[in-house]
Structure formats: structure tokens, C-alpha cells
Amino acid sequence: AILGRSETQECLFFNANWEKDRTNQTGVEPCYGDKDKRRHCFATWKNISGSIEIVKQGCWLDDINCYDRTDCVEKKDSPEVYFCCCEGNMCNEKFSYFPEMEVTQPTSNPVTPKPPYYN
């Protein structure tokens, strides 16, 4: 491993459509990928009238936008579906929205997912 890189071996898994898709709603996903590829965790969610609805969480693969990010932070301004990715085991357990704005001072809105969690 490269010094300073946080290896991702597993991520929080969550599927909002678990009943329809007949998977577990939540769990721990082992991340696999080619040795020359980096592995990440991600979270994706919607903000419905101020209420956070998690869509999916799990493993993400070799995306330069995720490199060396220890925290899962969405920086796009008001996306339809929020997405963040990070490196490090279970780094997607918590995620936040921190839009990069040119003029106004950015504000942080940390979000902690609250699905039931089972080992």
C-alpha cells in the first residue's frame, strides 16, 4: 500500500429498495477490484423537503474524484440526487453536504444515516 493511502476493504451497504429487490436493507459490503485499482465507499441520497432519504450506500471503484477523501462529502450545489465517495473502511457511515459556492460562505450540513444497522 502507498503510504498515507487509506485502503478500503468494506463499506456500509444500504438499499432503499430492499423489499422490491429482495436484498438485505443494510449490512457490510466487501469491496473487490483489480490490484491496480483503488476502492472506495459511497453514499447517495435525496433531500425531499428537508427530509433526508438515503438511496444507496456501498462500494465504489477507482474514481479519481474519490481519491484521498477520508470524509464522504457532496460538494455540488443542489444536485437532484446527492452523491459522495471516500476512502477508508466504512467511511460512508456518515456523509454530509458542503456545497462549494463562489460568493457566499459555504455551510456544512452533516447528515448521519439512521437505517437499522445489523452486523
Epitope: F13, N15, K20, D21, T23, N24, Q57, W60, E80
Partner: antibody
Framework: QVQLVQSGAEVKKPGSSVKVSCKAS????????ISWVRQAPGQGLEWMGG????????NYAQKFQGRVTITADESTSTAYMELSSLRSEDTAVYYC?????????????WGQGTMVTVSS | EIVMTQSPSSLSASVGDTVTITCRAS??????LAWYQQKPGKAPRLLIY???QLHSGVPSRFSGSGSGTHFTLTISSLQPEDFATYFC?????????FGPGTKLEIK
């Protein structure tokens, strides 16, 4: 590196069933996400359903609900797809495929395909 | 179910050309969009996952972009081995659905 090896071609009568197997070589079969995709001659690709062996339950495309059963045997690292009440329109190549992740980022490793011909 | 459309359905190009194939989803699929290449008699091959991530072993002349409902696959400096059929697929919501395909032929 995972490899998927499927069972051989089948010729079936209308109304009968077919069961196609897909043996995986490589580590941790139970953690894979396996899908089944079919392709009729000269046609496009159609996702039938999938399974994560560690969870055991499969999910199916509505079109095939009640007619398809996808299972996995962890002891032999083999996934199965059974399609019943066969009709001529089910003539196709059936592929088992591994997904990159449980959230289905992309179908990265494909079996060689199994040709199923339904004919009276 | 989410309906995927592709355009064009076929196109002719020459070695060295740059071509772009478009894929549209009937509803948003975020980044859950993959592109595949298929040659006659062969299984499809994954090219791009996550809308824009190049799969292992795929040449860098292939690139993908887009999110939501509109996606593109671009092949720059076409090589003889690139003439094939290309499919997009959404895996945001079951049933996962494929586009009808774009056949890329030699001019």
C-alpha cells in the same frame, strides 16, 4: 480473478423447463452479485434477475416473475437459473454475469453463454 | 420500468474518426449507467461503469460522461477492433434495463 463457466446448449419443447448452471472459480463466491441476462438471436440484452449468494434471495424482472427461479449453491460455487413454461420466444443465449458491486455498478465478468432453443 | 433509448441506432465511421453515442433514460438513474461493447457471437464486454469510469483493460480512447437522464459514450481515434455494437444499461432501479444498441460500422 473470477471466471464463470456455464452448462452446455439445450434444446427444449414448449411448456417444459430448463435449468442452466454457472460455476464460479475464484475467491468468496458468497460475496458476489450474480445476474442473468439473455439475448434472443439478433436482438438486444435483457436482464432477468440476480442474486447475492450470501443473502440467498433473488430478485427478478417483473416480466419473468413466477417463471424464473435463480438460486446459488455456496458449497459448489454455482449459480442456477431455471426458466419454466418455455415458449418459442425464450429461444436465446443465456448469460450469467458477475457485477462489480452489490449496488450493481456494472456487469464485468460474463460466462460464455448457454444457447437454449425452444422448438416443437 | 426505466426505458433506455440510444441514438443513433447505427453509424458508419472510418478508422481514426471520433464518434459519440448517446443514451437517454426515461427517468433519472444518477450515475448508475454502464456501457458495453459486443461483437458477433461473443459475450458483451464492460467498457464504462458509473457513467464515466473506465473499466480495467479498456483503452483510454473510450470515455463516458453524463448523469441523471443523459449520457454519452465517446470513442476517439477509432481503431479497426472498435467496430461492434454498443449497449448502455441502467442499474439504478430494477429491472435493470439496456438500450437497444448502436451498431458501429466501417465506412
Amino acid at each position: 480473478q473470477v471466471q464463470l463457466v456455464q452448462s452446455g446448449a439445450e434444446v427444449k419443447k414448449p411448456g417444459s423447463s430448463v435449468k442452466v448452471s454457472c460455476k464460479a472459480s475464484g475467491p468468496r463466491f458468497q460475496d458476489l452479485s450474480i445476474s442473468w441476462v439473455r439475448q434472443a438471436p439478433g436482438q438486444g440484452l435483457e436482464w432477468m434477475g440476480g442474486i447475492i449468494p450470501i443473502y440467498g434471495t433473488a430478485n427478478y424482472a417483473q416480466k419473468f416473475q413466477g417463471r424464473v427461479t435463480i438460486t446459488a449453491d455456496e458449497s459448489t460455487s454455482t449459480a442456477y437459473m431455471e426458466l419454466s413454461s418455455l415458449r418459442s420466444e425464450d429461444t436465446a443465449v443465456y448469460y450469467c454475469v458477475k457485477d462489480l458491486t452489490w449496488t450493481n455498478l456494472g456487469l464485468d465478468i460474463w460466462g460464455q453463454g448457454t444457447m437454449v432453443t425452444v422448438s416443437s | 420500468e426505466i426505458v433506455m433509448t440510444q441514438s443513433p441506432s447505427s453509424l458508419s465511421a472510418s478508422v481514426g474518426d471520433t464518434v459519440t453515442i448517446t443514451c437517454r433514460a426515461s427517468q433519472g438513474v444518477s450515475r448508475w449507467l454502464a456501457w458495453y461493447q459486443q461483437k458477433p457471437g461473443k459475450a458483451p464486454r464492460l467498457l464504462i461503469y458509473g457513467a464515466g469510469q473506465l473499466h480495467s483493460g479498456v483503452p483510454s480512447r473510450f470515455s463516458g460522461s453524463g448523469s441523471g437522464t443523459h449520457f454519452t459514450l465517446t470513442i476517439s481515434s477509432l481503431q479497426p477492433e472498435d467496430f461492434a455494437t454498443y449497449f448502455c444499461q441502467q442499474s439504478y432501479s430494477t429491472p435493470f434495463t439496456f438500450g437497444p444498441g448502436t451498431k458501429l460500422e466501417i465506412k
